[in-house]
C-alpha cells in the first residue's frame, strides 16, 4: 500500500502517513521532491502533526545572531534551534497554518494557540500574521501581529532604539516586545531573557519554550484518516 503523502509537505502529512513518533522527518515544500527540508515533528502535543521551528531549553545555542542567520536557520533540530525565516515563509505559503507555543518552567506549563499564522516573504521582511488566540499563557503575540522581523543588523522595529540590540535577541519587534523567546537564556534582567509577558512577565527568563505550526484544518484531516 502506497503512502497517502509520498512527499509530505509538513508534519501533519507525515503523521497521516502513519508516523506517530516525535523526531526528525523530511518534508517537501509544496510536495516538491527537490525542496526537501529536515524538520523536528512534535507528534504528541494536542494531537501532534506540528513542525517545531523554535526550541529553547538550556542556553547552549547562541540566539543573538544576524539577519542572515535568522533567514537561513541555525542550531540542532533535536536541541536548541531556529528553523529559519525563509523556511517558515515557504511553509506557511502552502496553506492556512496555526501556531502553538509551549512554555514550561519548574514544573509549570502554559500554552498559546493562534488559529491563523503566517510569515511573509523576504521582501516583506518576513512580516508576521498571528490571529485567533486561545490558551493559558496569555495573548502576548497579539502585540507583534503585523510586524516585520528584526535583528541587530536589520532594524525594522518602531522604537527609537534598536530592539534586537537592546534586548540581545531577534523577533518581530514593535517597540519593543511582549514576547522575546529568542532572548538571552537565563537572563532575568528586565526584558532581556526568554520572555512571554502575560505568563511570567519581563523579569523572568523561561526555562523551556517551543514554537510550532501545523495546518489549521488538521482536525478535519485527522478525522478523515480515522474514518478511512
Amino acid at each position: 500500500i502506497g503512502l497517502l503523502y509520498p512527499f509530505p509537505r509538513d508534519c501533519s502529512q507525515a503523521m497521516l502517513n502513519g508516523d506517530t513518533t516525535s523526531g526528525l522527518y523530511t518534508i517537501y515544500i509544496n510536495g516538491d521532491k527537490t525542496q526537501a527540508l529536515e524538520v523536528y515533528c512534535d507528534m504528541t502535543s494536542d494531537g501532534g502533526g506540528w513542525i517545531v521551528f523554535l526550541r529553547r531549553k538550556n542556553g547552549r545555542e547562541d540566539f543573538y545572531r544576524n539577519w542572515k542567520a535568522y533567514a537561513a536557520g541555525f542550531g540542532d533540530r533535536r536541541e536548541e534551534f531556529w528553523l529559519g525565516l525563509d523556511n517558515l515563509s515557504k511553509i506557511t505559503a502552502q496553506g492556512q497554518y496555526e501556531l502553538r507555543v509551549d512554555l514550561q518552567d519548574h514544573g509549570e506549563s502554559a500554552y498559546a494557540v493562534y488559529d491563523r499564522f503566517s510569515v511573509g516573504d523576504a521582501k516583506s521582511r518576513y512580516k508576521l500574521k498571528v490571529e485567533g488566540y486561545s490558551g493559558t499563557a496569555g495573548d502576548s503575540m497579539n502585540y507583534h501581529n503585523g510586524r516585520s522581523f528584526s535583528t541587530y543588523d536589520k532594524d525594522t522595529d518602531s522604537a527609537i532604539t534598536n530592539c534586537a540590540l537592546s534586548y540581545k535577541g531577534a523577533f518581530w519587534y514593535k517597540n519593543c516586545h511582549r514576547v522575546n523567546l529568542m532572548g538571552r537564556y537565563g537572563d532575568n534582567n528586565h526584558s532581556q531573557g526568554v520572555n512571554w509577558f502575560h505568563w511570567k512577565g519581563h523579569e523572568y527568563s523561561i526555562q523551556f519554550a517551543e514554537m510550532k505550526l501545523r495546518p489549521s484544518n488538521f482536525r478535519n484531516l485527522e478525522g478523515r484518516r480515522k474514518r478511512a
Epitope: Y133, Y143, N145, I160, N175, H177
Partner: antibody, heavy 120, light 107 residues
Framework: QVQLVESGGGLVQPGRSLRLSCAAS????????MHWVRQAPGKGLEWVSG????????YYADSVKGRFTISRDNAKNSLYLQMNSLRAEDTALYYC?????????????WGQGTMVTVSS | DIQMTQSPASLPTPVGDRVTITCRAS??????LNWYQQKPGKAPKLLIY???NLETGVPSRFSGSGSGTDFTLTISSLQPEDFATYYC?????????FGQGTKVDIK
C-alpha cells in the same frame, strides 16, 4: 470615515444601573480591541475597561471591577459598558476608544463622550 | 499599578517657543508610552505612540523621545492651536494609566 459615537449617559441615582453604547463605523470592528476611558469634571483621564477584538478577553480597572461589565457585538459594530451599583465617584464623561493595534496599545480613535452623572 | 508622573502641571509659554513636557513611569516600561492632546470640550487626540512615532496627520513640530522610565514630548515651535492639555499614557501593562496632565497656556 472612522467614527465612534457613544450614547446612554444620563442622570442616575447611586446604586442604580446604566448601560452605555458605542457605535463604530469606518473600520473593521472585530480586528481591534476597544476601551472605555472616563474623565471626571475638571480632572484627568482614567482608563476604565477594555475588550479584545473577539470579545474573548476583558480587562477592568480595580475601581470598577465587579460592578462594570464590558461587552461587544461584532455583528452590530457596537461596544457596551454595563454599569451597576453606581457611585458618586463614577460621575464622569465616558469615552469609547479604539486600540491602535494590540489589546494594550495607544488609543488612536476616540468618540465625543457621553456624560454620566450619579447623584441623588 | 504603574504610576505616571508628568511635569510641569502647568506651562505658560509664548507662541513660537520650544515646549518640553516630561513623563516618568514608576517602573520600566520599555517604549510603551503614548502622548495625547486634549482641548477644552473635546476628546483626546493621539499625537505620539510607542514613545517616538508620530501619528498620521500630526504636525512634525511634535516629537517624542525616551525609553525605560523617562520620556519627553517636545513641541519645537509652539503654535496658537497647540494650547491644550497634554497627557502621557503607558500601554505596557493593564491597567493602562495616564499622567495627570500638563496644561500649556498662553504666557
Amino acid at each position: 470615515q472612522v467614527q465612534l459615537v457613544e450614547s446612554g449617559g444620563g442622570l442616575v441615582q447611586p446604586g442604580r444601573s446604566l448601560r452605555l453604547s458605542c457605535a463604530a463605523s469606518g473600520f473593521t470592528f472585530d480586528d481591534y480591541a476597544m476601551h472605555w476611558v472616563r474623565q471626571a469634571p475638571g480632572k484627568g483621564l482614567e482608563w476604565v475597561s477594555g475588550i479584545s477584538g473577539s470579545g474573548g478577553s476583558t480587562y477592568y480597572a480595580d475601581s470598577v471591577k465587579g460592578r462594570f461589565t464590558i461587552s461587544r457585538d461584532n455583528a452590530k459594530n457596537s461596544l457596551y459598558l454595563q454599569m451597576n451599583s453606581l457611585r458618586a465617584e463614577d460621575t464622569a464623561l465616558y469615552y469609547c476608544a479604539k486600540s491602535y493595534q494590540s489589546d494594550e496599545d495607544a488609543f488612536d480613535i476616540w468618540g465625543q463622550g457621553t456624560m454620566v452623572t450619579v447623584s441623588s | 499599578d504603574i504610576q505616571m508622573t508628568q511635569s510641569p502641571a502647568s506651562l505658560p509659554t509664548p507662541v513660537g517657543d520650544r515646549v518640553t513636557i516630561t513623563c516618568r513611569a514608576s517602573q520600566y516600561i520599555q517604549g510603551f508610552l503614548n502622548w495625547y492632546q486634549q482641548k477644552p470640550g473635546k476628546a483626546p487626540k493621539l499625537l505620539i505612540y510607542d514613545a517616538s512615532n508620530l501619528e498620521t496627520g500630526v504636525p512634525s513640530r511634535f516629537s517624542g523621545s525616551g525609553s525605560g522610565t523617562d520620556f519627553t514630548l517636545t513641541i519645537s515651535s509652539l503654535q496658537p492651536e497647540d494650547f491644550a492639555t497634554y497627557y502621557c499614557q503607558q500601554s505596557y501593562s493593564t491597567p493602562q494609566t495616564f499622567g495627570q496632565g500638563t496644561k500649556v497656556d498662553i504666557k
